[in-house]
């Protein structure tokens, strides 16, 4: 393991439509994938009317947009769907709501932007 | 395994649209992105756009911007890649292709546009 | 036009080390470890050989190495086979915040 960074094995695990889509509901779901790639935790949910609805939480693929983020954070403006992704083991029980300033992207096809 | 089924291939008039589509397995669909590559005969790769395929955000290539919409259904782990008012240099091979980093790919999708 | 520059061929003979560069700027390429590199055989899908500038992909061939120097990153092909013949791509990660770019392609001819 690199030292200071946390390995992900599991997250919390929630489904919103777990009927229709025949899953569990809640739990912890173990994360799968190759040994040598990066494995994170998500959390997306819903702001209707100020009330929180949890859409779904899980296992994450590696992903640049989650190195190194101990907490679960929507950084975007109002998306319709809020998403969030962490490294760590359950880091996704938690997550929060910070929007950035936005930046008027170039009128050139974007390249890759420094993280935040 | 993981794999990405494309639906097959098109033939569209200019001024049309077409709606390819990708059906993922052998991981859960909802845990990254789906990313769009087109390749016009003889031509290099070109990203159209992505799509966060649990929370359904999406961000798209400015060259496409306006006439491109990505969706997916996560009921059935496939994603959509839809252009409108098609052109005759539309014409290419669509690619779907997992996560960020384009680890697996779809086989691909022949759009034909000529009238 | 590409916002990643490759040289449209190269060729070498069995056994030879070619290298495929892929030129970006510093706000790219050269900020970030996130260039990768795809081989595609015509008629074929790209296939993934390396991620994060230099770390292969299972069950590609050690022969197929990346590196990086300033805001140029290289793919280098040792011991070059007849299967390596193909078209090689660079591009970067795509999701999130982040933005897709190829480069224009490499035609590797073995000789």
């Known amino acids: 393991a690199i030292l200071g960074r946390s390995e992900t094995q599991e997250c919390l695990f929630f489904n919103a439509n777990w009927e229709r889509d025949r899953t569990n509901q809640t739990g912890v779901e173990p994360c799968y994938g190759d040994k040598d790639k990066r494995r994170h935790c998500f959390a997306t949910w819903k702001n209707i009317s100020g009330s929180i609805e949890i859409v779904k939480q899980g296992c994450w693929l590696d992903d640049i947009n989650c190195y190194d983020r101990t907490d679960c954070i929507e950084k975007k403006d109002s998306p319709e769907v809020y998403f969030c992704c962490c490294e760590g083991n359950m880091c996704n029980e938690k997550f929060s709501y910070f929007p950035e300033m936005e930046v008027t992207q170039p009128t050139s096809n974007p390249v890759t932007p420094k993280p935040p | 395994q993981v794999q990405l089924v494309q639906s097959g291939a098109e033939v569209k008039k200019p001024g049309a649209s077409v709606k390819v589509s990708c059906k993922a397995s052998?991981?859960?669909?909802?845990?990254?992105?789906i990313n769009w590559v087109r390749q016009a005969p003889g031509q290099g790769l070109e990203w159209m756009g992505t799509i966060n395929a649990v929370s359904g955000s999406t961000s798209y290539a400015q060259k496409f911007q306006g006439r491109v919409t990505m969706t997916r259904d996560t009921s059935i782990s496939t994603a959509y890649m839809e252009l409108s008012r098609l052109r005759s240099d539309d014409t290419a091979v669509y690619y779907c292709?997992?996560?960020?980093?384009?680890?697996?790919w779809g086989q691909g999708t022949l759009v034909t546009v000529s009238s | 036009q590409s916002a990643l520059t490759q040289p449209a061929s190269v060729s070498g003979s069995p056994g030879q080390s070619i290298t495929i560069s892929c030129t970006g700027t510093?706000?790219?390429?050269?900020?970030?470890?996130?260039v990768n590199w795809y081989q595609q055989h015509p008629g074929k899908a790209p296939k993934l050989m390396i991620r994060g500038v230099s770390k292969r992909e299972s069950g590609v061939s050690n022969r197929f190495s990346g590196s990086k120097s300033g805001n140029t990153a290289s793919l280098t092909i040792s011991g070059l086979q007849a299967e390596d013949e193909a078209d090689y791509y660079c591009?970067?990660?795509?999701?999130?915040?982040?933005?897709?770019?190829f480069g224009g392609g490499t035609k590797l001819t073995v000789l």
């Open positions: 052998g991981y859960t669909f909802t845990s990254s992105y």
């Open positions: 292709a997992r996560g960020g980093w384009f680890d697996y």
């Open positions: 510093s706000s790219d390429v050269g900020s970030f470890n996130y």
């Open positions: 591009g970067t990660f795509a999701g999130g915040a982040y933005y897709g770019v």
